[in-house]
């Protein structure tokens, strides 16, 4: 019965693919993965971002964005407990909310950046549930009906799971990019050594490479105080 319910849920999700708002349900204390599919050709060369909607008509406050170098967008970038990684070839932006808390519930956006402009890839409504034992299985997930205010919403089938420490879900295309990056560094290192030998310099003083494939510098954004109607 369980697999059948999940299949039905998956089917409904796929039918709803064109809708504006997707609901992702997560469990407090666990990790939630949000995926935002996009046209990889249309958004070629563009960095991506994850932002939180401040009120119904307010601005979208940037939480985290992909690597400054678009080629390195597959590297996971953190801000606090939120991570972002972009499979630029496959056209999937993935956001991980680690140690989900009640206050993480709200409206978010996946964005594609170009200059000072930002295109919305997907509007995401994050729901936080208290405890997996407190809630019915996937077949009983909430589906917006006629009376729902978010009539364009649908429930995403990927419910949160606990990520193991150090687990990095690399998409296959990102591995290709990583290999290409390593290959490029090797070529740069080899050519630097060759240049050093050619000029009679000591090897080991190769020019610094801007391509850093193993390390994600990341950055800490200042958290804005909660906007309330109080």
């Amino acid at each position: 019965m369980e697999p059948l319910r999940l299949l039905i849920l998956l089917f409904v999700t796929e039918l709803s693919g064109a809708h504006n708002t997707t609901v992702f349900q997560g469990v407090a204390g666990q990790s939630l993965q949000v995926s935002c599919p996009y046209d990889s050709m249309k958004h070629w060369g563009r960095r991506k971002a994850w932002c939180r909607q401040l009120g119904e008509k307010g601005p979208c406050q940037r939480v985290v964005s992909t690597h400054n170098l678009w080629l390195l967008s597959f590297l996971r970038r953190w801000n606090g407990s939120t991570a972002i990684t972009d499979d630029t070839l496959g056209g999937t932006l993935t956001i991980t909310l680690r140690n989900l808390q009640p206050h993480d519930a709200g409206l978010y956006q996946c964005q594609s950046l170009h200059g000072s402009e930002a295109d919305t890839l997907r509007k995401v409504l994050v729901e936080v549930l208290a405890d997996p034992l407190d809630h019915r299985d996937a077949g009983d997930l909430w589906f917006p009906g006629e009376s729902e205010s978010f009539e364009d919403a649908h429930v995403e089938h990927s419910i949160s799971r606990s990520l193991l420490e150090g687990e990095i879900p690399f998409p296959p295309t990102s591995i290709l990019l990583l290999l290409a990056c390593i290959f490029l560094i090797k070529i740069l290192a080899a050519s630097a050594l060759w240049a050093a030998a050619w000029h009679g310099q000591k090897p080991g003083t190769h020019p610094p490479s801007e391509l850093d494939c193993g390390h994600d510098p990341g950055y800490q954004l200042q958290t804005l105080p909660g906007l309330r109607d109080t």
Partner: antibody, heavy 123, light 107 residues
């Protein structure tokens, strides 16, 4: 101005159920969490659970798990709290309260309160 | 669940005096702490949210401070209408929990 109006006082027999309503007016109903808090005579405040109407899924305090059901009807902007298997110690004033959150859907700061509904459980 | 301990249980003061109420959490609640005032026969009233932000319409004599596990509500100069029971409440983790309350009574 947001107002929460609760249903009237109830007298119930042990083992029975009670359903208290909370009608909201003067503000957006859907995206604000509605919590239910109870207060036994001469005692402190106790959070029972809450719901965000747009999500439709309630979260409950473990103590009330299995006995309480919180629902919301967006068409009438009304939240409901049903408590079953009543016992004498459930005699209390039951309040509904709305979150002050704007984009923080579960802000937890309870800005608006209903007038309270006294539920008396007596044989 | 997170346990909130309020002290003192009762505070006997005169109008015009300064009141300092304490709330201690069994584990960090960051700044997700609110303070409420309740008078007999009335529903609680939100005074402070996010540890230090005054709610709309709350007089400036009420102020909140603290983060993590230790929080304080201060009433700089007590007015006759301030004599009531005060509760702290955390919303860092479910279930939301309240402190046992501090009764501020006239000396």
């Amino acid at each position: 101005q947001v107002q929460l109006v609760q249903s009237g006082a109830e007298v119930k027999k042990p083992g029975s159920s009670v359903k208290v309503s909370c009608k909201a007016s003067g503000g957006t109903f859907s995206s604000y969490a509605i919590s239910w808090v109870r207060q036994a005579p001469g005692q402190g405040l106790e959070w029972m659970g809450g719901i965000i109407p747009i999500f439709g899924t309630a979260n409950y305090a473990q103590k009330f798990q299995g006995r309480v059901t919180i629902t919301a009807d967006e068409s009438t902007s009304t939240a409901y709290m049903e408590l079953s298997s009543l016992r004498s110690e459930d005699t209390a004033v039951y309040y509904c309260a709305r979150d002050s959150g704007n984009y923080d859907y579960w802000s937890g700061a309870l800005r608006y309160w209903g007038q309270g509904t006294l539920v008396t459980v007596s044989s | 669940e997170i346990v909130l301990t309020q002290s003192p249980a009762t505070l006997s003061l005169s109008p015009g005096e300064r009141a300092t109420l304490s709330c201690r959490a069994s584990q960090s609640v960051s700044s997700y702490l609110a303070w409420y005032q309740q008078k007999p026969g009335q529903a609680p009233r939100l005074l402070i949210y996010d540890a230090s932000n005054r709610a709309t319409g709350i007089p400036a004599r009420f102020s909140g401070s603290g983060s993590g596990t230790d929080f304080t509500l201060t009433i700089s100069s007590l007015e006759p209408e301030d004599f009531a029971v005060y509760y702290c409440q955390q919303s860092s983790n479910w279930p939301w929990t309240f402190g046992g309350g501090t009764k501020v009574e006239i000396k």
